[in-house]
Interface confidence: medium
């Protein structure tokens, strides 16, 4: 374990003593705590404005949370020799607003990356692929956690936020080995249609607490390994036949649909029929109607076809204001 002037040797994490001498390979950076036995470095809530340069080569788990990094440039973690063991990198809540292409290059073992709670006004299309080639070298990432990375409205670029995130996820087909993707709490209005097709290994997809209105143009068909699909707390009104069939065809999936404003009219009939026979939806007995007003709080599983009607559309000449 690294030496320190202020901590006892029995402590699991030892704070670094600042030193003017050139860093040793396994010295602990200033303002960080290091444990070689746990292969962990924590530089947490220290208002760091850049990634420490003198990270120990043994680091496997790196926590850089609660800092003020602002920009993550290309090669932010590139070292000579490389941080070959670094497997889990947590940058959550570090006030990042820009992640540039190649920011995570030269991390051959990086399996988990958490960028949550950073207001990312700019996420390079090549943030995860590291290259602008049409097919990049596969990323080692297995888990990518991007919860609450939406910037405030006044910091958004002209292009859609959904499109910016999607471009980074599909670039160079680098994330074909991704097993977990968390995109909760990002105000997504839609899911770009080509994203999931480029992520065939997904086991766990969290899209909860967004503003998704429809899944009509989203295809889950090739996500044959998917185990958990979280769609709670969105703005879903109904799931149509195509989506229902795709979800039913996934061999291992569990779908979470709580707290969506389901519209219980004639368009809901197929979904209700499906809910009654499927084992795919977790907590399906909790799903209730939000609209129309006369159906509010009715349990979807308790509805029958007679309950699900649509008001006839009147010709314009007969409509009243």
């Amino acid at each position: 374990t690294s030496s320190a002037s202020s901590s006892s040797s029995s402590a699991p994490f030892l704070a670094s003593a600042a030193s003017a001498q050139p860093p040793l390979p396994d010295q602990c950076p200033a303002l960080c705590e290091c444990s070689e036995a746990a292969r962990t470095v924590k530089c947490v809530n220290r208002n760091l404005t850049e990634v420490p340069t003198d990270l120990p080569l043994y680091v496997r788990n790196l926590f850089l949370t609660g800092n003020q990094l602002a920009v993550l440039p290309a090669g932010a973690f590139a070292r000579r020799p490389p941080l070959a063991e670094l497997a889990a990198l947590n940058l959550s809540g570090s006030r990042l607003d820009e992640v540039r292409g190649g920011a995570f290059e030269h991390l051959p073992s990086l399996r988990q990356l958490d960028l949550s709670h950073n207001p990312l006004a700019y996420l390079s299309p090549f943030a995860f692929s590291g290259s602008n080639a049409s097919i990049s070298a596969p990323s080692p990432l297995v888990e990518l956690i991007l919860n609450h990375i939406v910037p405030p409205d006044d910091k958004r670029q002209n292009r859609s936020f959904e499109g910016m995130v999607a471009a980074a996820l599909v670039a160079g087909r680098a994330l074909q080995g991704l097993h977990l993707l968390e995109l909760a709490s990002n105000h997504f209005l839609y899911l770009p249609r080509d994203v999931l097709a480029q992520l065939p290994s997904l086991r766990y997809l969290d899209l909860s607490n967004n503003s998704l209105v429809s899944l009509t143009y989203v295809s889950f068909r090739n996500l044959t390994h998917l185990e958990s699909l979280h769609l709670e707390d969105n703005a879903l009104k109904v799931l149509h036949n195509g989506t229902l069939a795709e979800l039913q065809g996934l061999p291992h999936v569990r779908v979470f649909l709580d707290n969506n404003p389901w519209v219980c009219d004639c368009h809901m009939a197929d979904m209700v029929t499906w809910l009654k026979q499927t084992g795919v939806v977790q907590g399906k007995d909790r799903l209730t109607c939000a609209f129309p007003e006369k159906m509010r709080n009715r349990v979807l599983l308790e509805l029958n076809s007679a309950d699900l009607d649509c008001d006839p559309i009147l010709p314009p000449s007969l409509q009243t204001s």
Partner: antibody, heavy 122, light 110 residues
Framework: EVQLEESGGGLVKPGGSLRLSCAAS????????VGWVRQAPGKGLEWVSI???????YYANWAKGRFTISRDNSKNTLYLQMNSLRAEDTAVYYC????????????????WGRGTLVTVSS | DIQMTQSPSTLSASVGDRVTITCQAS??????LAWYQQKPGKAPKLLIY???TLESGVPSRFSGSGSGTEFTLTISSLQPDDFATYYC????????????FGQGTKVEIK
Amino acid sequence: EVQLEESGGGLVKPGGSLRLSCAASGIDLSHYVVGWVRQAPGKGLEWVSIIYGSGRTYYANWAKGRFTISRDNSKNTLYLQMNSLRAEDTAVYYCARDASVSVYYWGYFDLWGRGTLVTVSS
Amino acid sequence: DIQMTQSPSTLSASVGDRVTITCQASQSIGSELAWYQQKPGKAPKLLIYRASTLESGVPSRFSGSGSGTEFTLTISSLQPDDFATYYCQQGYTYSEIDNAFGQGTKVEIK
């Protein structure tokens, strides 16, 4: 020193229950995927259960419904509650830590306890 | 349900021999495979993860290879300390499985 130490094993009658504990020192267990692996006398390793940092749990098919994994982060301790025990559950039970932090998925154990022996016999 | 099958079950060898143990998965597990060494009365020790990455502190005479369904552990020159039982373990999924480990290969003195 980073280590895991199991306790709670012993002799129990068929149909009985037992709760195993695994206390961690030198690491914050809440950051890691941790689990249980067992080994019957003279037999091979058998995976039992894991719990992720997120609280998500997995069990071997044969353990579902009888075994429950849990953790107490304030005590830095992992537990395995075993109910309806059978003679074939006799084994050394190891607590093991996954090789890196993960909310969901990883896949190999780099730190093991010494094990605690559970004997199920009338 | 993914099953892991090791062969051989027992292997007799001499110091200095090159030893190869194979592990077969019943379906593709990519590179998500680990190898462990266990000595009597002791806990297992991680040797190799992600099919071919040597765990820190493990001698370089140990190596792993393979992907998909076929994997190999090789000891290039068997040392006295290497007589033990070796297990493979898939880390591809923990969902709906009976066991993540192979049944083991005992390497004994010839």
